[in-house]
């Protein structure tokens, strides 16, 4: 912590300007009035402060705003944003997309994924929902950041906004996030024709249930293996060999290359070997011919 000293009269600060770069840490602490700093935050980013000096300025703002900074200050943080922790950001209330853009630009190239995720979360809370303007801002200034939001926050996305989401924006989404986004995408694209629908729904299919995957297999979509591998394991396991063959079309030979990877490996283990042999790919590991499969869960339910 910066030790408290009295400000020498000749060092008194009446405005935030370049002369402050020559102040030692303790002089900044003693001589810069926090309210003045907050009022002239727009000047701070143009001044080449050292990281140590920025620590002092942050400390001043923290003392002035223990409950969190107002948006008028947040908007002009500039490189001071790099000093913020997720805990600091959690106290903020941000509604302006200009503020979000400014801070996303500053964070670029820095290891700030936790801070950025918290900032985006605060923007969604502040604006009440994940509206089209917010999604457009995220896709433009922070590809992949959409996936930093929790499933709970993503549930506030109206289906009408889904069209603004690009495949690369979903690249880092996990299964729980896609579970939330997929039904919205299905709704958003429901009036499209088969091939156009598949192109649009493809990035969201990691959240699709078995019945929807089965339905796709009847539509000659020729799903590529990259998409197939992103499907939920639970959605893939009930598919028959014939359904998978129809679903993948000419890409079916890719099963051989991926046979060691889940969900292909798990699916192979559930198929009859003679069914797998019909594919002519040399897939091994299916249930041997002549074996019976007993579903013990059904038997337990009956007893």
């Amino acid at each position: 912590d910066v030790e408290r000293t009295t400000c020498p009269p000749e060092k008194e600060v009446h405005e935030i300007d370049e002369s402050l770069i020559f102040y030692k840490k303790r002089e900044l602490e003693a001589c810069v009035d926090a309210a003045l700093l907050a009022a002239q935050m727009d000047r701070v980013d143009a001044i080449p402060f050292t990281y140590e000096q920025l620590d002092v300025l942050k400390h001043k703002l923290d003392e002035l705003y223990p409950q969190g900074y107002p948006e008028s200050v947040i908007r002009h943080l500039g490189h001071l944003f790099l000093k913020m922790s997720p805990e600091d950001i959690r106290k903020w209330n941000v509604t302006s997309l200009e503020t979000l853009k400014a801070l996303l630009k500053v964070s670029k190239g820095h290891e700030m994924s936790a801070q950025v995720a918290t900032l985006i979360d605060r923007v969604v809370v502040g604006r009440g929902q994940l509206d089209k303007d917010t999604v457009d801002t995220l896709t433009a200034f922070c590809p992949g950041c959409l996936c930093s939001l929790s499933p709970e926050r993503l549930s506030s996305v109206p289906p009408s906004v889904i069209g603004a989401v690009r495949p690369q924006d979903l690249d880092t989404c996990g299964p729980r996030q896609l579970d939330v986004l997929y039904p919205k995408a299905r709704l958003a694209f429901q009036n499209m024709s088969g091939s156009e629908y598949f192109v649009k729904i493809r990035p969201f299919l990691g959240g699709a249930p078995t019945e929807d995957v089965k339905a796709l297999s009847q539509q000659n979509v020729s799903m590529d293996l990259a998409t197939f591998m992103k499907l939920r394991r639970e959605a893939v396991l009930p598919l028959t060999v014939a359904e998978v063959q129809k679903l993948l079309g000419p890409h079916v030979e890719g099963l051989k290359v991926e046979e060691q990877h889940s969900p292909v490996r798990d699916w192979i283990l559930k198929q009859r070997q003679d069914d797998l042999d019909t594919l002519g790919l040399g897939l091994q590991g299916g249930i041997p011919n002549g074996y019976l499969i007993l579903d013990l869960s059904v038997r337990e339910a009956l007893s």
């Epitope: 590529d224 990259a226 991926e258 889940s262």
Partner: antibody, heavy 119, light 108 residues
């Protein structure tokens, strides 16, 4: 432009571990597996294993089992290959190479990372 | 594992001459699952041919591939100076994926 950029050369003592990174750019990271291939001085190519960046699932060449670990960081579009219990025979150039999921050929390669194991 | 044996190990060839490199597999390889790479000194390997006979993007048409089962061939129809390199065949028909030992082509 599609690029795979690997971390710099390493010199390690026998018994130590090395972790090589491979940063991808210019394509959808999760549509391609990342494989690792090594080449000892004056020798041929040897496949070590691969990772599916979408699921984090890995397959290793059994020759390296227990010694090699491949991981990914989707947010940074980066994969890592760590080789432990190094011996002098592990001196080689290590390449990452992308492979479109469902195919087995490597259409883009990293520049290679030289790992030297010497006491 | 499938062992891929390339021959010859080394070939010294005059420009404009035809070069044939063979890759023999210890057991059958599905032809969709064989590729060829070119590696020049101090460079990373480069994809030349995939699925036995398909030319990779940007590869000159003087390169071609053929074969099935256990015997595969890479042909350079009219060798050019820039083709001096080591060539590797590679299979992913069976786990673990393997490479041939390489054929070094030198310009006379």
């Amino acid at each position: 432009e599609v690029q795979l950029v690997q971390s710099g050369a390493e010199v390690k003592k026998p018994g130590a571990s090395v972790k090589v990174s491979c940063k991808a750019s210019g394509y959808t990271f999760t549509d391609y597996n990342m494989d690792w291939v090594r080449q000892a001085p004056g020798q041929g190519l040897e496949w070590m294993g691969d990772i599916n960046p979408s699921t984090g699932g890995t397959i290793y060449n059994q020759k390296f089992n227990g010694r090699v670990t491949m991981t990914e960081d989707k947010s940074a579009s980066t994969v890592y290959m760590e080789l432990s219990s190094l011996r002098s025979e592990d001196t080689a150039v290590y390449y990452c190479a992308r492979r479109r999921i469902g195919t087995g050929y490597f259409d883009v390669w990293g520049q290679g990372t030289t790992v030297t194991v010497s006491s | 594992e499938i062992v891929l044996t390339q021959s010859p190990d080394f070939q010294s060839v005059t420009p404009k001459e035809k070069v044939t490199i063979t890759c023999s597999a210890s057991s059958s390889v599905i032809s969709s699952y064989l590729s060829w790479y070119q590696q020049k000194p101090d460079q990373s390997p480069k994809l030349l041919i995939y699925r036995t006979s398909n030319l990779a993007s940007g590869v000159p048409s003087r390169f071609s591939g053929s074969g099935s089962g256990t015997d595969f061939t890479l042909t350079i129809n009219s060798l050019e100076a820039e083709d001096a390199a080591t060539y590797y065949c590679h299979q992913w028909s069976s786990f673990p994926y393997t490479f041939g030992g390489g054929t070094k082509v030198e310009i006379k």
